[in-house]
C-alpha cells in the first residue's frame, strides 16, 4: 500500500481467483483514543472500533472510502483504491491502446517546436467517475523539471456504437534550450482513476522524436504564363522554432483530386516555393518536416486549384 | 559562445555540402547497423545516450544562433580555447566566435574518427564478420575535417591488446552512431545558419 | 494487371511523320499520367512528355515543341505520340510509360522502334 | 535543365559483392530523384522513387539514398539477374531528366 495524495491510498493486489489479497492496517487521524467507530462509504453499518482498523483487502467490495467517527463526529477518511497486477502485468482497463506506433501506446505525445513545450492526450471509452493526474521530468535518476497543467477532455467521438473520450495535457520544459542535443528523455506519468480503480500509465521520449509541425501557412498560387503549371508559395509556420536557418524545414508538395486513388503530382523542396501542374477539382496541399531530423510530417496546408 | 551575424559571404561556404553528406552518411550506417544488429539493443530507446565529447568540446554552445543566446536555458559557462585558421572561414569578416564554433566541430569529428576507427579495428576480428563501418562514412567525416582544416594534435588511435568483447563492440558501435548522429544533426543546422547569415 | 502495348516498328524517312500507339489494360485509362520516352540505340533514355487521358492536357520536354503532338482516344484505352520533321538522329526506340504519380514511370510499354533512313 | 551525371560508367563486380552506383545533380533536386533498372532488349523498371522508396516486389537488397544533389543506389549484394544498366531520372522540375546510365557487368 502507497500514498497516492493526502487522505488516498492505493492497495496494489495480485488478481486471480482465490487469491489472499492484502492486508490493511488503517489509523484514525485523531489524537483521540476511545470510542471510535470504523464506516464504509455512505454504509451506517460499523465495521470495528478502534484507533486502527485491520481489513483484508481482496476486490473492489472492500475498497472506497473509510471513515473513523467519534459520537457521530467524523475524524477523518481513509480512500483506497485498487491496482490490479493479473500475471505480473499491472492493469491497463481505463485507456484504450492507440497501437501507434507500437502496440501497448497509451499515452501519445507531440510537440510543434523545439521549446521544450509538447502535448500528450489518451482515449478512453469511460464518461464519468474518472479522474487524471499527471508528471513529468528530464530523467528520472536525477529529475529536472517539467511542468504539466491539468488534464482536459479535448474531444469526444463516436465510434460505432461506442463514445470515445479523448484527455489531453499540456507540459512545458522548466529550463528548454531549443538547439539543446537531448541525452536524457522526458518522462510522462499519469494517474487514471476510474471509481475504485487505480492505474499509472508513462511514456517517455525525446522531444526530437516527438517534433510535427503546425502545416505551413499563407499558401498562394501563381500561374505561369503559357503553361500548366503553377507556383505555389507558403511560409514558415509560426509555431516553428526560430532562426529558420538553422531549424530548417523541408516540405512536400502535392497536388491530387478529392479521392486519395486519384493521380497527383508530387515534388519535394526545401525551398518556400515550388512549381507543380494544376488539374481542375484538384487541390495543392504542402505539409512541412524537419530537415534534418525526420520526425512526423506536419498535417497538409490546402488550397484548391481553382 | 554565440555566432554573431557577420559570417561569411553567399556561397563561399564549403563545408555545408560537407556537413549534409556526413549526416546522410551516419544515418545510412545507424540504419544498416540497427537492420544488422536487430537482435542487440541498437535503438534508441534501448541504448544509453553517451555523448563522448561532453566536457570536451562545447559545440552546441559555441554554435549557438544569435537568437538563440538571449535564452538563459542555451548559456552555458563551458568554455574552451581553440586554434582558429579554418578554411570553411572563406572571409575575413569572419569572427572569432565563428571560428571556435567551427573548431569545435574539428574536435568533435577528430574524436568520434579515432573511436569509429578504433572500433572498426576490432570488428575486423570478429569472427562472424557481422558488421563494419561504412568506408564512405569515415570518409565523409575526413572530407569535413579536411574543409574546416584545422591544425590539431593527432589523437592516436586507441590500440588495446586484450581479446575484444564482441557484443559488448556492437553495442557501443550502437551508442557512437546514435550519438553522432545528434551531433552531425547539430553540424548540418550550424553550417545551414552560417550559410544563410 | 496493368499493362501497354505499343505498335510495330516503323522505317521512316526523313522529313517524314510517324505516328506510335499504345493500347492501356488493366486499368481506368484516365487514372494515369501517359509518358512517352525515348532511347537511341547504345545510348541513355530522354523524356519527351505527357498527357493526362482525363482532358487531354499536354507538357512537352522544350527539345520537342512544336515537332510532338501527344492524343489519346478514351473509347479504346489508346494513346498516341507523332513525331513530325523526322531527322535520322530520331532513330530510337519510343517507349510509352505510364504512373499515378506525374513525375515518374510505374510501367513501362515494351517499345517501338523507328528507324528514320533514306 | 537538370544535368543529371552517373558514375561510374561502368562497373564491374563479382556475384555476391555490394555495388554502389551515383548520381548527381546539376542544382538541388531535394529527394525528387528514381532509380531503374534496364537489361538488354527491355523497357526499364522502377527500382526506387523518391531517393530511399523501395517498391513491392523489388528485392530489398536494392536501396536508394541522398538528397540535394547527391544521391547512391546500393544493391548490397549481387545476383546474376542484376547485371545490367541502372537509370537515375530527376522529377524536381521540367524537363525531366535522366543521368547517362552506369552499366554492371560481372567482374
Known amino acids: 500500500i502507497w500514498e497516492l495524495k493526502k487522505d488516498v491510498y492505493v492497495v496494489e493486489l495480485d488478481w486471480y481467483p482465490d487469491a489472499p489479497g492484502e492486508m490493511v492496517v488503517l489509523t484514525c487521524d485523531t489524537p483521540e483514543e476511545d470510542g471510535i467507530t470504523w464506516t464504509l462509504d455512505q454504509s451506517s453499518e460499523v465495521l470495528g472500533s478502534g484507533k486502527t482498523l485491520t481489513i483484508q483487502v481482496k476486490e473492489f467490495g472492500d475498497a472506497g472510502q473509510y471513515t473513523c467517527h467519534k459520537g457521530g463526529e467524523v475524524l477523518s477518511h481513509s480512500l483506497l483504491l485498487l491496482h490490479k497486477k493479473e500475471d505480473g502485468i499491472w492493469s491497463t482497463d481505463i485507456l484504450k491502446d492507440q497501437k501507434e506506433p507500437k502496440n501497448k501506446t497509451f499515452l501519445r505525445c507531440e510537440a510543434k517546436n523545439y521549446s521544450g513545450r509538447f502535448t500528450c492526450w489518451w482515449l478512453t471509452t469511460i464518461s464519468t467517475d474518472l479522474t487524471f493526474s499527471v508528471k513529468s521530468s528530464r530523467g528520472s535518476s536525477d529529475p529536472q523539471g517539467v511542468t504539466c497543467g491539468a488534464a482536459t477532455l479535448s474531444a469526444e467521438r463516436v465510434r460505432g456504437d461506442n463514445k470515445e473520450y479523448e484527455y489531453s495535457v499540456e507540459c512545458q520544459e522548466d529550463s528548454a534550450c531549443p538547439a539543446a542535443e537531448e541525452s536524457l528523455p522526458i518522462e510522462v506519468m499519469v494517474d487514471a482513476v476510474h471509481k475504485l480503480k487505480y492505474e499509472n500509465y508513462t511514456s517517455s521520449f525525446f522531444i526530437r522524436d516527438i517534433i510535427k509541425p503546425d502545416p505551413p501557412k499563407n499558401l498562394q498560387l501563381k500561374p505561369l504564363k503559357n503553361s500548366r503549371q503553377v507556383e505555389v508559395s507558403w511560409e514558415y509556420p509560426d509555431t516553428w522554432s526560430t532562426p529558420h536557418s538553422y531549424f530548417s524545414l523541408t516540405f512536400c508538395v502535392q497536388v491530387q483530386g478529392k479521392s486519395k486513388r486519384e493521380k497527383k503530382d508530387r515534388v519535394f523542396t526545401d525551398k518556400t516555393s515550388a512549381t507543380v501542374i494544376c488539374r481542375k477539382n484538384a487541390s495543392i496541399s504542402v505539409r512541412a518536416q524537419d530537415r534534418y531530423y525526420s520526425s512526423s510530417w506536419s498535417e497538409w496546408a490546402s488550397v484548391p486549384c481553382s | 559562445r554565440n555566432l554573431p551575424v557577420a559570417t561569411p559571404d553567399p556561397g563561399m561556404f564549403p563545408c555545408l555540402h560537407h556537413s549534409q553528406n556526413l549526416l546522410r552518411a551516419v544515418s545510412n550506417m545507424l540504419q544498416k547497423a540497427r537492420q544488422t544488429l536487430e537482435f542487440y539493443p541498437c535503438t534508441s530507446e534501448e541504448i544509453d545516450h553517451e555523448d563522448i565529447t561532453k566536457d570536451k568540446t562545447s559545440t552546441v554552445e559555441a554554435c549557438l544562433p544569435l537568437e538563440l543566446t538571449k535564452n538563459e536555458s542555451c548559456l552555458n559557462s563551458r568554455e574552451t580555447s581553440f586554434i582558429t585558421n579554418g578554411s570553411c572561414l572563406a572571409s575575413r569578416k569572419t569572427s572569432f566566435m565563428m571560428a571556435l564554433c567551427l573548431s569545435s566541430i574539428y574536435e568533435d569529428l577528430k574524436m568520434y574518427q579515432v573511436e569509429f576507427k578504433t572500433m572498426n579495428a576490432k570488428l575486423l576480428m570478429d569472427p562472424k564478420r557481422q558488421i563494419f563501418l561504412d568506408q564512405n562514412m569515415l570518409a565523409v567525416i575526413d572530407e569535413l575535417m579536411q574543409a574546416l582544416n584545422f591544425n590539431s594534435e593527432t589523437v592516436p588511435q586507441k590500440s588495446s591488446l586484450e581479446e575484444p568483447d564482441f557484443y559488448k563492440t556492437k553495442i557501443k558501435l550502437c551508442i557512437l552512431l546514435h550519438a553522432f548522429r545528434i551531433r552531425a544533426v547539430t553540424i548540418d543546422r550550424v553550417m545551414s545558419y552560417l550559410n544563410a547569415s | 494487371q496493368v499493362q501497354l502495348v505499343q505498335s510495330g516498328a516503323e522505317v521512316k524517312k526523313p522529313g517524314a511523320s510517324v505516328k506510335v500507339s499504345c493500347k492501356a489494360s488493366g486499368y481506368t485509362f484516365t487514372d494515369y499520367y501517359l509518358h512517352w520516352v525515348r532511347q537511341a540505340p547504345g545510348q541513355g533514355l530522354e523524356w519527351m512528355g505527357w498527357i493526362d487521358p482525363e482532358n487531354g492536357d499536354t507538357e512537352y520536354a522544350p527539345k520537342f515543341q512544336g515537332r510532338v503532338t501527344m492524343t489519346t482516344d478514351t473509347s479504346t484505352s489508346t494513346a498516341y505520340m507523332e513525331l513530325r520533321s523526322l531527322r535520322s538522329d530520331d532513330t530510337a526506340v519510343y517507349y510509352c510509360?505510364?504512373?499515378?504519380?506525374?513525375?515518374?514511370?510505374?510501367?513501362w510499354g515494351q517499345g517501338t522502334m523507328v528507324t528514320v533512313s533514306s | 535543365e537538370i544535368v543529371m551525371t552517373q558514375s561510374p560508367a561502368t562497373l564491374s563486380v563479382s556475384p555476391g559483392e555490394r555495388a554502389t552506383l551515383s548520381c548527381r545533380a546539376s542544382q538541388s533536386i531535394s529527394i525528387n530523384l528514381h532509380w531503374y533498372q534496364q537489361k538488354p532488349g527491355q523497357a526499364p523498371r522502377l527500382l526506387i522513387y523518391?531517393?530511399?522508396q523501395s517498391i513491392s516486389g523489388i528485392p530489398a537488397r536494392f536501396s536508394g539514398s541522398g538528397s540535394g544533389t547527391e544521391f547512391t543506389l546500393t544493391i548490397s549484394s549481387l545476383q546474376s539477374e542484376d547485371f545490367a544498366v541502372y537509370y537515375c531520372q530527376q522529377s524536381n522540375s521540367f524537363p525531366l531528366t535522366f543521368g547517362g546510365g552506369t552499366k554492371v557487368e560481372i567482374k
Open positions: 523518391f531517393a530511399s
Open positions: 510509360a505510364a504512373n499515378k504519380e506525374l513525375r515518374y514511370f510505374d510501367v
